[in-house]
């Protein structure tokens, strides 16, 4: 089971109109540049076999991957939104740094790995897609971690 007290984000993180708006604007800008509409990274399949109590830990993995492998390499794109949204998401990641689960997390890693593989397979267009789904990342973090 998760060390649940650490797998928590305060509701206030998701109630800041300015940065929320910038996050959604960034997602919209990127989705306009995404021409691969057949693929969805964040959706029901990501959570397959993952209990409600484990979902924040799963989303922490997705958030960290998105920051390290997508947003940092693409940090010069989609300005001015990117320069504001990346530090916000990095703060959320930092607040989840002590979120772990005890025991086997192989089922979670398997689901996250599929997302990573899809992004890598698609190359730069996979990174654009991941940025275009930041609204879904935001909502999934909110639902899983508050």
């Amino acid at each position: 089971a998760p060390i649940s007290s650490h797998c928590r984000l305060d509701k206030s993180n998701f109630q800041q109109p300015y940065i929320t708006n910038r996050t959604f604007m960034l997602a919209k800008e990127a989705s306009l540049a995404d021409n691969n509409t057949d693929v969805r990274l964040i959706g029901e399949k990501l959570f397959h076999g993952v209990s409600m109590s484990e979902r924040c830990y799963l989303m922490k993995q997705v958030l960290n991957f998105t920051l390290e492998e997508v947003l940092f390499p693409q940090s010069d794109r989609f300005q001015p939104y990117m320069q504001e949204v990346v530090p916000f998401l990095a703060r959320l990641s930092n607040r989840l740094s002590t979120c772990h689960i005890e025991g086997d997390d192989l089922h979670i890693q398997r689901n996250v790995q599929k997302l990573k593989d899809t992004v890598k397979k698609l190359g730069e267009s996979g990174e654009i897609k991941a940025i275009g789904e930041l609204d879904l990342l935001f909502m999934s973090l909110r639902n899983a971690c508050i």
């Epitope: 959604f24 919209k28 029901e44 909502m139």
Partner: antibody
Framework: QVQLVESGGGLVKPGGSLRLSCAAS????????MSWIRQAPGKGLEWVSA????????YYADSVKGRITISRDNAKNSLYLQMNSLRAEDTAVYYC????????????WGRGTLVTVSS | DIQMTQSPSTLSASVGDRVTITCRAS??????LAWYQQKPGKAPKLLIY???SLASGVPSRFSGSGSGTEFTLTISSLQPDDFATYYC?????????FGGGTKVEIK
């Protein structure tokens, strides 16, 4: 092309039961959340129920909780709505519609099936 | 539950008019708002999703804007085919909820 075809509507007495079906084609059915929405004669749209692609999560409007059960058979590309203890206020056209996930709109709708609850 | 309030309930307009319909949510729904068009005896048709994104095959005279609690649907130049009833719908949270509808009729 995407097609959703509802069936099973008809005239039923108050307190009676009915099972609606929605046959889906033209897309990977198991990938989509499915919803039932109803519209009373001359009135607006009211969402009734939804089910996740796997069938593992279900959602209901308060007005129908305990009386209605949503289910799906992904092998048959079919969605169902079991309606029990029917009331006059359940009289409506019932539409099935698809949405890819939780935060997706209802992008395709069926033509609807009319349920009339009357003695 | 999130309440969706649409105004006006009826709107009389002429071909070529610019038409604006407003939808207000009882709490913030980010951009998770859709607009649908319905003609008598027909199923609703998706026009706009994510508050401002145009659904496939929808003419560019339709546009949506807003976020949080205030949203608008605009038809830049009303066409004969646009006389119908329009509904907003939030999909931020279950239960999904619709506005009461706006009937656009010929003046």
């Amino acid at each position: 092309q995407v097609q959703l075809v509802e069936s099973g509507g008809g005239l039923v007495k108050p307190g009676g039961s009915l099972r609606l079906s929605c046959a889906a084609s033209g897309f990977t059915f198991s990938d989509y959340y499915m919803s039932w929405i109803r519209q009373a004669p001359g009135k607006g749209l009211e969402w009734v129920s939804a089910i996740s692609g796997s069938g593992g999560s279900t959602y209901y409007a308060d007005s129908v909780k305990g009386r209605i059960t949503i289910s799906r058979d992904n092998a048959k590309n079919s969605l169902y709505l079991q309606m029990n203890s029917l009331r006059a206020e359940d009289t409506a056209v019932y539409y099935c519609a698809r949405g890819l996930w939780v935060w997706d709109p209802l992008d395709y709708w069926g033509r609807g099936t009319l349920v009339t609850v009357s003695s | 539950d999130i309440q969706m309030t649409q105004s006006p309930s009826t709107l009389s307009a002429s071909v070529g008019d610019r038409v604006t319909i407003t939808c207000r949510a009882s709490e913030g729904i980010y951009h998770w708002l859709a607009w649908y068009q319905q003609k008598p005896g027909k199923a609703p048709k998706l026009l706009i999703y994510k508050a401002s994104s145009l659904a496939s095959g929808v003419p560019s005279r339709f546009s949506g804007s807003g976020s949080g609690t205030e949203f608008t649907l605009t038809i830049s130049s009303l066409q004969p085919d646009d006389f119908a009833t329009y509904y907003c719908q939030q999909y931020s949270n279950y239960p999904l909820t619709f506005g009461g509808g706006t009937k656009v009729e010929i003046k």
